[in-house]
Structure formats: C-alpha cells, structure tokens
C-alpha cells in the first residue's frame, strides 16, 4: 500500500548534541522497518547521515539525530525516505527550533529563616552558549490538593529559588519540578524536570502564642 | 608521513580526454575531502573539483563543469579527475591535496593541508 | 562567487623585517564565532604549495610561529615575522567557505 505523511516532521535541537524530529503518519507503521530520515548539514563536503526512526505511538516516528556542536548558521537538509520512496524534504536550522535540555538534580533544602532552597542543575556546560542564557519556570504543588500550587519564574542566572515555609501549607507534601526556557533564541520549554517531594514542616506564627 | 603522487599528465590534443590519478598513503583517506587544484604556466592557483569523503558529493569550478569528473576509489587510496572535451586553456600542473575532515556532522577544516607534487596536462594541437 | 582580493601583489623584504600581505574577501567567511574559512599558501620557487594557516589564524603543522594570520569577516593579513632568505616566494590566500574556492591573485615575496 502507499506510505503517506499525515503531519510532516517537526523538529527540535538542545544545541548541543542532538536534535529530534518527530512526525505522525497516516496509517500504524513500524517506524524503524519502514522508514529512514536522511540528514546532511549545509556546508562544503559534508556527508549524508541516515537516522533509523522509532515509535512513540502506533502511527508517530521520533527520530534522534547527533549533531555537532551547534552554530546559528548551521542548516540540515532533511528527506523522508520509506524504501527508495521519497516521503517528505525539507530544511532544519537548530538555532532556529531550540529545546533546552531538562535541568537536573532539583533538590530541596531547609535553608535559614523558614525557607526552603530549591536548587537544581543548568543542563549545558558553561562554554555553551545556552548556559547563560536559560530562565526557569519552578511549579510546585500541593501533592493531596491540585488547587494549591504556585509558579515561579526564576529570570536570574542561578539555578535556584528560595521558597518561604510560611507560603505553603504546613503539615503537607509538596512537589517542585523545573523546565527551562532560552529566551534569545525564542526556544520552546524544556521537558520537566523529574518531581521532588518533601513535607513542609513549618509551624504558622498564631501556633506559638 | 603524509603522500600524495598524482601521474596522467601528457600532452593532449583539444577535445581530447585525460584521466588523472591520485595515490594517497599516510592517513585515513576516506575520512577526508579530496581537492584537484590546477595552476596554469606562470599564473596562479585556480581551485578545479572536490569530492567528499565517501564519493557522495562533488563539487566543480565552472569553467570545468560538465566537462571533468573527480571521484574517487577508498579501497585503493585513489582519487580520480577524468577530464574530457579539453581545451587549450586547460593547460596546468594540476595537484591534489587533502581537505576537510568530513566524517564528522561538520567538516573539520585545516585547510589544503597537504599537496602532491602536481602532474603536467598539455593541450595543444 | 567569493572574489579574493590581495595587496600588495609583490614585496620586497630586507632580512629581519616584518612583511604584511593583506587579503580581502566580497563576502564574509565567518561562519561562526572563531571561525573564518580562510587560508594561506606559500608556494616557493619549483615546489608545490604548503599550508601556512587554516581558519584565519590558526598555524598548520609545522609552520614556525613567525607566520601569524589575523582577521575576521572580510579583512585578513598575514605577518611573516624576522623574514628569512627561505621565506622566499609567492603567497596565496584562499577561501573555503563555499563552492567554488577561490584564491587570490598571489603576493611575490622578495628578500632584499
């Protein structure tokens, strides 16, 4: 039967190693059998390079490229073979579809005066050029009440925010996750961050009197 | 130690056809960009084809185009410049040298890093 | 086509001096930061070229360091430090950006 594309390859890059297409097609297809993405950087002598796509769901191929370090001025050309059929072309410049990597590590800390500290990892070594250019976006959330979260954008370099106890309901679990964002490169939010929990012991002022 | 020993330079009639060959030794020649460069008598360089590392694409000078081809054999550490329709002005030493690293996503650049010693083409009635 | 423009196309050097050769590009050759794909040749009397610099300023193999290259976009120059009789003949630079590559004209080095 005829291979189609239902909705065309939409990719992202972390700009650092690696950039990802993913497209949905019009019937359920084992993606690594069927299909391959070609992938050739736009500069004088490179090679072809063929990606081998995996399913995410039945009928959606995700593909994962390595990519050199990135430069703005880098452009893939990009072919959608199924067989010596040609499916789908079309071009890619990572600095222009970026999607940070996820931050890491997020770990709360009790910190002076009843506060928490929340930290976490910048995804990126510091001689990428996205290292000093991520804000976050910290959601935390009341585990036993899904009207109690709060989120906070973190527009300072640090990887950190300090959360006071007496904002949160004592007594309760609360969870943090983190996602990241390039605001110069007008990139997409990063995936979460894997959730922390911890219980938030703080005693409201009235409970000492 | 890095070598390179271009041979089939003659003396041709125009129209004629040439073919010139490249023996490379010293380092992993499929990883790398091959270039022709010719240099007419007593004038400059003139870059003529490249070809990347696996054959897969080339790349010619205009006044050349349609006329040569430069490929490659990776089993045998050979480069290729198959020259047809000759003309006068085609009259060079032509060398080859290494260019750029093309196995990674990138090319790595270093330049024309390391030249043949260049074989005569004479086109002449 | 990138068009390579050197000056002066010959010089004349006593022993000891500095010689500067100057080559302008009609579109930039960074690509990106550090970057610039231009190289320079010297090719001596009866020889075949050799590489002096890759990417603007970066020394090739064996190159001493009295050969530096310095510039950025579209202006590059090449400074041959404490010239020797051997530095003797002509200097190319070439661009490697995009097809076609192109050289410029050449600059004859002549030790006084």
């Known amino acids: 039967g005829s291979v189609k594309v239902l909705h065309e390859p939409s990719c992202f890059s972390d700009y650092i190693s690696t950039s990802v297409c993913q497209w949905k097609m019009d019937h359920p297809t084992n993606c690594s059998a069927e299909l391959r993405l070609s992938y050739q950087l736009d500069f004088m002598g490179s090679e072809n390079h063929t990606c081998v796509p995996e399913n995410r769901e039945d009928s959606v191929c995700v593909c994962s490229m390595p990519i050199d370090d990135a430069v703005e001025a880098d452009v893939y050309q990009l072919d959608l073979w199924a067989g010596q059929q040609l499916l789908w072309s079309g071009s890619f410049q990572p600095s222009k579809h970026v999607k940070p990597r996820t931050p890491g590590n997020l770990t709360v800390h009790p910190n002076i005066s009843h506060t928490w500290l929340l930290m976490w990892t910048n995804p990126y070594p510091t001689e990428n050029h996205l290292h000093s250019e991520l804000t976050y976006m910290v959601n935390v959330s009341n585990d036993n009440d899904p009207e109690d979260f709060k989120v906070y954008n973190v527009t300072y370099m640090g990887p950190t925010l300090r959360l006071a106890a007496s904002t949160l309901k004592s007594g309760a679990s609360y969870s943090a996750r983190v996602r990241a964002w390039a605001q110069t490169y007008n990139s997409t939010w990063s995936d979460w961050s894997p959730s922390t929990t911890w219980l938030n012991y703080y005693e409201p002022w009235e409970q000492h009197l | 130690e890095v070598q390179l020993v271009e041979s089939g330079g003659d003396l041709v009639k125009p129209g004629g056809s040439l073919r010139l060959s490249c023996v490379a030794s010293?380092?992993?020649?499929?990883?790398?960009?091959m270039t022709w460069v010719r240099q007419a008598p007593g004038k400059g360089l003139q870059w003529v084809s490249l070809?990347?590392?696996?054959?897969?694409?080339?790349y010619y000078a205009d006044a050349v185009k349609g006329r040569f081809t430069i490929s490659r054999d990776n089993a045998k550490n050979t480069l290729y410049l198959q020259m047809n329709s000759l003309r006068a002005e085609d009259t060079a030493v032509y060398y080859c040298?290494?260019?750029?690293?093309?196995?990674?996503?990138?090319?790595?650049?270093?330049?024309?890093?390391?030249w043949g010693q260049g074989t005569l083409v004479t086109v002449s009635s | 086509d990138i068009v390579m423009t050197q000056t002066p196309l010959s010089l004349s050097v006593s022993p000891g001096e500095t010689a500067s050769i100057s080559c302008r590009s009609s579109?930039?050759?960074?690509?990106?930061?550090?970057?610039?794909?231009l190289d320079w040749y010297l090719q001596k009397p009866g020889q075949s070229p050799q590489g002096l610099i890759y990417?603007?300023?970066k020394r090739a193999s064996g190159v001493p360091d009295r050969f530096s290259g310095s510039g950025s976009g579209t202006d590059f120059t090449l400074r041959i430090s404490r010239v020797e009789a051997n530095d003797t003949g002509v200097y190319y630079c070439?661009?490697?950006?995009?097809?076609?590559?192109?050289f410029g004209q050449g600059t004859k080095l002549e030790i006084k």
């Open positions: 040298a290494v260019d750029r690293l093309t196995k990674t996503i990138r090319p790595q650049y270093y330049g024309l890093w390391a």
């Open positions: 010293g380092f992993t020649f499929r990883d790398y960009a």
């Open positions: 070809i990347n590392g696996t054959g897969g694409k080339t």
């Open positions: 579109q930039s050759l960074l690509y990106s930061i550090g970057y610039n794909y």
């Open positions: 990417l603007g300023s």
């Open positions: 070439m661009q490697g950006l995009q097809s076609p590559l192109t």
